[in-house]
């Protein structure tokens, strides 16, 4: 039975040209995290593997930095970065937990963080 929950940074906004940290946290489970994938729509941005550490997809190497923790830092943001981001926790023995973050990249300097929320 999957008892864990993923808490994410929820709906967030940031300025064009700036950077943002995407964060997820898995709690309420003793499952072992094998790997965390960060995905944007159908694209794989990065992997944090329990055995082998971080690997950033070559097409994102210039604008994506690992961390802090299991999070992901997006840099040099463009309006095209607006959209859904997913943290996918592969665990044993529970299976897969997925968290969703919506990022809006704003032209203006008004960029406020949204509320945090949980996904069971």
């Amino acid at each position: 039975m999957m008892t864990g929950t993923i808490e994410t940074t929820g709906n967030i906004s940031a300025e064009k040209g700036g950077s943002i940290i995407l964060q997820c946290h898995l709690s309420s489970t003793t499952a072992q995290v094998t790997q965390v994938n960060w995905e944007q729509q159908d694209q794989l941005l990065a992997i944090c593997n329990a055995d082998l550490g971080w690997h950033i997809s070559p097409s994102f190497k210039d604008r994506v930095a690992p961390g802090p923790g299991l999070g992901l830092t997006l840099q040099s943001l463009t309006v095209n970065d607006t959209g859904e981001y997913f943290c996918i926790y592969h665990t044993y023995p529970d299976g897969t937990y997925t968290g969703r973050i919506f990022l809006e990249v704003l032209e203006s300097s008004v960029a406020e963080h949204g509320a945090r929320f949980q996904i069971p």
Partner: antibody
Framework: EVQLVESEGGLVQPGASVKLSCVGS????????MSWVRQTPGKTMEWIGN????????NYAPSLKNRFTISRDNAKNTLYLQMTNLRSEDTATYYC???????????????????WGQGVMVTVSS | DIQMTQSPSSLPTSLGDRVTITCRTS??????LRWFQQKPGKSPRLMIH???NLANGVPSRFSGSRAGSDYSLTINSLESEDMAMYYC?????????FGSGTKLEIK
């Protein structure tokens, strides 16, 4: 705790066939690539081949691919190595190793081999 | 196949020494190189992955480096528990290939 336990080896005749097995526990076996590696008595390490997490794809060392076959049964958490027409130069300790997690990218490499079994000695001699 | 030329094959050492083992590759493999340690009667243990990254639980006296097609494993201030065989492995392309091994021995 991740564990890989190979079946017992032993003495086999030249020309004979042997099927080794390796049972994995403490991890999601069906989500990982698995490999076989052997080590000769002279301590030379040789990669034999690997198999995709779902068993649909295998790679082999060219010198061994005609005689060795890797397979897996995910329902039993078991990896196999079928060896045929054995020769004296096949005498070695055979290790199964856990490869990378199924959802990965090329930069993580072909086979992680972070976890190894204890090894099983196969001696080919008449 | 990619050839891995590992040297030296044997290295007499003293405790506290700084030790370097090298593998030279016949083709470019990027950073797709791992180092393994093997003690007598034991299975190999991953020490370095990605040419320079320390594996989980490996003491910080171990380090990996790359200079072109030469890859090195360095042990700063050798300890008795480091006496073992060391192997490099390239995983840039199939078939994966190992170096011939280096045996660390007490002088």
């Amino acid at each position: 705790e991740v564990q890989l336990v190979e079946s017992e080896g032993g003495l086999v005749q030249p020309g004979a066939s042997v099927k080794l097995s390796c049972v994995g526990s403490g991890f999601s076996f069906s989500d990982h690539w698995m490999s076989w590696v052997r080590q000769t008595p002279g301590k030379t390490m040789e990669w034999i081949g690997n198999i995709q997490y779902d068993g649909s794809y295998t790679n082999y060392a060219p010198s061994l691919k005609n005689r060795f076959t890797i397979s897996r049964d995910n329902a039993k958490n078991t990896l196999y190595l079928q060896m045929t027409n054995l020769r004296s130069e096949d005498t070695a300790t055979y290790y199964c190793t856990r490869g990378h997690f199924r959802i990965t990218m090329a930069s993580m490499g072909a086979s992680a081999s972070v976890y190894w079994g204890q090894g099983v000695m196969v001696t080919v001699s008449s | 196949d990619i050839q891995m030329t590992q040297s030296p094959s044997s290295l007499p050492t003293s405790l506290g020494d700084r030790v370097t083992i090298t593998c030279r590759t016949s083709q470019d493999i990027g950073n797709s190189l791992r180092w393994f340690q093997q003690k007598p009667g034991k299975s190999p243990r991953l020490m370095i992955h990605g040419a320079t990254n320390l594996a989980n639980g490996v003491p910080s006296r171990f380090s990996g480096s790359r200079a072109g097609s030469d890859y090195s494993l360095t042990i700063n201030s050798l300890e008795s528990e480091d006496m073992a065989m060391y192997y490099c492995l390239q995983h840039n392309e199939y078939p994966l290939t190992f170096g011939s091994g280096t045996k660390l021995e007490i002088k």
